[in-house]
């Protein structure tokens, strides 16, 4: 997260880190005791999932292996549409005040809505500085019409933009797949943006979760 702040401890109990060994690979969001939602571009063969701590590499955090993941069947490595994936944990999470599932959206929030994005991604760009603490940034949803002025045809119908006018605050390397939460519901998953990160008036681009609720529910049901 560029130009963000340290999240209030315990305020993001649904935030997970997808690790490759002990190294951060992507963010993710707990949606069920067996399931984590993340970006399709975060796919790996297997994952170590850290839950229940704001500190990356915390020894006291829950760590659960995941060997199965399900990309949206329409994910395109060319256009990056449908950049969403479910990761099935090998064993269920122990729910607590520190580990909770996020609320999936009932509706799509409108432009102008205030949201928070979080992650352990680099706080500087292009040179990287990875924080140990979970970082947050407060951003507002931007209309597709406004966002297309920046990204033109790169912006797909199920992509969502968020940012703050004239501000550098944005997501960056390592934040991928992490949550954009608006009014206590999951509205976005970090997908992409311009580089170096934090260029004012270049919004962050997210997968618009409200458009995928049916796919999420059906996929979890199918692979129970």
């Amino acid at each position: 997260i560029i130009d963000g702040y340290k999240c209030k401890e315990g305020s993001h109990p649904w935030q997970v880190a997808l690790l490759k060994g002990n190294q951060l690979h992507c963010g993710g969001v707990l949606v069920d005791k067996y399931w984590v939602l993340t970006a399709a571009h975060c796919k790996m063969g297997q994952y170590q999932v850290q839950l229940g701590s704001d500190k990356i590499g915390d020894q006291s955090a829950q760590k659960i292996k995941a060997t199965k993941s399900f990309r949206h069947p329409g994910y395109s490595t060319k256009t990056h549409v449908n950049d969403i994936m479910l990761v099935r944990l090998d064993e269920p999470v122990k729910m607590s005040s520190k580990v909770e599932a996020v609320q999936l959206p009932e509706h799509c929030e409108p432009p102008g809505t205030s949201c928070t994005v979080s992650g352990w991604g680099t706080t500087t760009s292009p040179d990287v500085t990875f924080p140990s603490d979970l970082m947050c940034s407060d951003v507002k949803l931007i209309s597709s019409r406004e966002c297309k002025k920046v990204y033109k045809d790169l912006l797909g119908k199920t992509m969502l933009c968020a940012g703050i006018p004239d501000s550098k605050t944005n997501t960056c390397n390592g934040d991928s797949g992490g949550p954009l939460v608006c009014n206590d519901t999951l509205q976005g998953l970090v997908s992409w943006g311009t580089y170096p990160c934090g260029q004012p008036n270049d919004p962050g681009v997210y997968t618009q979760v409200c458009k995928y609720k049916r796919w999420v529910m059906e996929t979890m049901k199918t692979h129970r």
């Epitope: 690979h25 571009h41 490595t77 060319k78 950049d83 991604g121 390592g174 997908s191 992409w192 580089y195």
Partner: antibody, heavy 122, light 108 residues
């Protein structure tokens, strides 16, 4: 230091295969994609394809589809490009390059290997 | 696929000259165009990304401009070490990534 180091020059006969390696160091290999670009003698640059080091997702240039395979070995931070059924017009310098960006999209090549000369001759 | 056309294909110039190279895309690529410098026997080196942003460590005599389909690389005062071949590429509609044909800058 941040670098990509490629394997040495190769001389191959028409119809044979070649496998070029590209070892990354100084950065997190699995967080970036590796692209391959070639340059025939006295000619311009030609994009061949790319691979995501973490997912193994590949995209190949249409004209090379079926002849080229890109792979990675994350344990050694090495990318490989294999080209089969070699022809004389495959004679070129082959470069690996890192694409800079984050998340699903990348925007430019900020790091290149030194190049590997592949000569196809009978 | 988007075609990138560079012009001129070669030019002769003297040290201290102002040099301009153009790159035209077959359709709009917004500002997702980059410029590279390549010297004989060496790998290309990034000069400009996003049409106008100077890569770290590149001298300020290099500048880029343009958006949509027409782009320009300018060297404000040519130095001896600038004699090389210059390429543009587009990262807008990818894959494939497409390069311009190159412009060779030679000593007059």
């Amino acid at each position: 230091q941040v670098q990509l180091v490629q394997s040495g020059a190769e001389v191959k006969k028409p119809g044979a295969s070649v496998k070029v390696s590209c070892k990354a160091s100084g950065y997190t290999f699995t967080s970036e994609g590796i692209h391959w670009v070639r340059q025939a003698p006295g000619q311009g640059l030609e994009w061949m394809g790319s691979i995501s080091a973490s997912s193994g997702d590949t995209n190949y240039a249409q004209e090379l589809q079926g002849r080229v395979t890109m792979t990675t070995d994350t344990s050694t931070s090495t990318a490989y490009m294999e080209l089969r059924s070699l022809r004389s017009d495959d004679t070129a310098v082959y470069y690996c390059a890192r694409a800079a960006g984050y998340g699903a999209r990348h925007w430019y090549f900020d790091l290149w290997g030194q190049g590997t000369m592949v000569t196809v001759s009978s | 696929d988007i075609q990138m056309t560079q012009s001129p294909s070669s030019l002769s110039a003297s040290v201290g000259d102002r040099v301009t190279i153009t790159c035209r895309a077959s359709q709009s690529i917004s500002s997702y165009l980059n410029w590279y410098q390549q010297k004989p026997g060496k790998a290309p080196k990034l000069l400009i990304y996003g049409a106008s942003s100077l890569q770290s460590g590149v001298p300020s005599r290099f500048s880029g401009s343009g958006s949509g389909t027409d782009f320009t690389l300018t060297i404000s005062s040519l130095q001896p070490e600038d004699f090389a071949t210059y390429y543009c590429d587009q990262f807008y509609s990818t894959p494939p990534i497409t390069f311009g044909g190159g412009t060779k800058v030679e000593i007059k």
